[in-house]
Interface confidence: low
Amino acid sequence: VPRWRQQWSGPGTTKRFPETVLARCVKYTEIHPEMRHVDCQSVWDAFKGAFISKHPCNITEEDYQPLMKLGTQTVPCNKILLWSRIKDLAHQFTQVQRDMFTLEDTLLGYLADDLTWCGEFNTSKINYQSCPDWRKDCSNNPVSVFWKTVSRRFAEAACDVVHVMLNGSRSKIFDKNSTFGSVEVHNLQPEKVQTLEAWVIHGGREDSRDLCQDPTIKELESIISKRNIQFSCKNIYRPDKFLQCVKNPEDSSCTSEI
């Protein structure tokens, strides 16, 4: 008789999840000499231990502590780029501006980027059929708790000027319910962080509005100011030119009309 399995509302664990995590770990540690000491089998064991045999709606940050310990990594605290709803451009940016880092440029972020995973209570099986959806099922699921944990630690590590890339095409440019709005903003340390600088990425080619005046940006400014951190905002009117200008800021087209 087939065992009854809980049906969740979200997609199941990414296929070949264990192999993917292990392969990513090996690749990352090869590329980043400062992480060569990491034992990828131990990393996988710690990752697995965080959610296997546990109810996928009852995961805690504590479950991920062994993994956090193994993945401890020092990134330059003044070179951190946060993002919200504009991951691809943020990642393209750090690929060009190699001295800046998004969470997904760290080992733990790289391991989990774009993956889904969950287990089942009291069995060692990984659930490839379905996993809890954050809204429809529960917020304390393995994926959400992982990102909350690593995002909090990443924000806590930041210092000096922290940059955040925001999507100017969305109705809520700053969304209090995003990971940035609900976790990272509240875990920047005012004694270390002087300024949060928002880069609002415009979508339309002819859009010359000052989106730094958007009500949601003003809301972000208010939250940040109350935390004794200075706030700065810049429009990026032409994202198509943005990366080119990062590569070569002295290019004449970067200091004329963009």
């Epitope: 000096d160 000027v161 002087q194 300024t195 880069w199 000052d210 730094c212 200075q230 700065s232 905002c233 810049k234 429009n235 990026i236 009117y237 032409r238 200008c245 990062v246 800021p249 970067c254 200091t255 004329s256 009309e257 963009i258």
Partner: nanobody, 126 residues
């Protein structure tokens, strides 16, 4: 009312030096990053240098690195730009400004800043 007043410009020979000054009033100077930008005749606005609130962070356009030094006196609400080994291509009107609304690579005109001064002319010529 925010006021930024530049001074110290003039005519100087190539290789010479000038010290520009920007007197700020009407806002909390010490809480603002400050910027020097310039506009050469018939050219677009160009970022020159940036200084953080406490003066520890300084950033320069590549072509002025090692020749220009930006500094500030928060007690006097004054922004300074020491320009050494001046070249003919440094000829421009120099402005101090605050509250940029764009990345410096995207600078188009003075309206890209919340506030700016009237400018001071620097001419490098033999």
């Amino acid at each position: 009312e925010v006021q930024l007043v530049e001074s110290g410009g003039g005519l100087v020979q190539p290789g010479g030096s000038l010290r520009l000054s920007c007197a700020a009033s009407g806002f909390t100077f010490s809480s603002n990053w400050m910027y020097w930008v310039r506009q050469a005749p018939g050219k677009g606005l160009e970022w020159v240098a940036t200084i953080s609130t406490d003066g520890r962070g300084t950033y320069y356009k590549d072509s002025v690195k090692g020749r220009f030094t930006v500094s500030r006196d928060n007690a006097m609400s004054t922004l300074l730009l020491q320009m050494n080994n001046l070249k003919s291509e440094d000829t421009a009107v120099y402005y101090c400004a605050k509250e940029p609304r764009v990345l410096m690579a995207y600078l188009r005109n003075l309206g890209d800043f919340g506030s700016w001064g009237q400018g001071t002319q620097v001419t490098v010529s033999s």
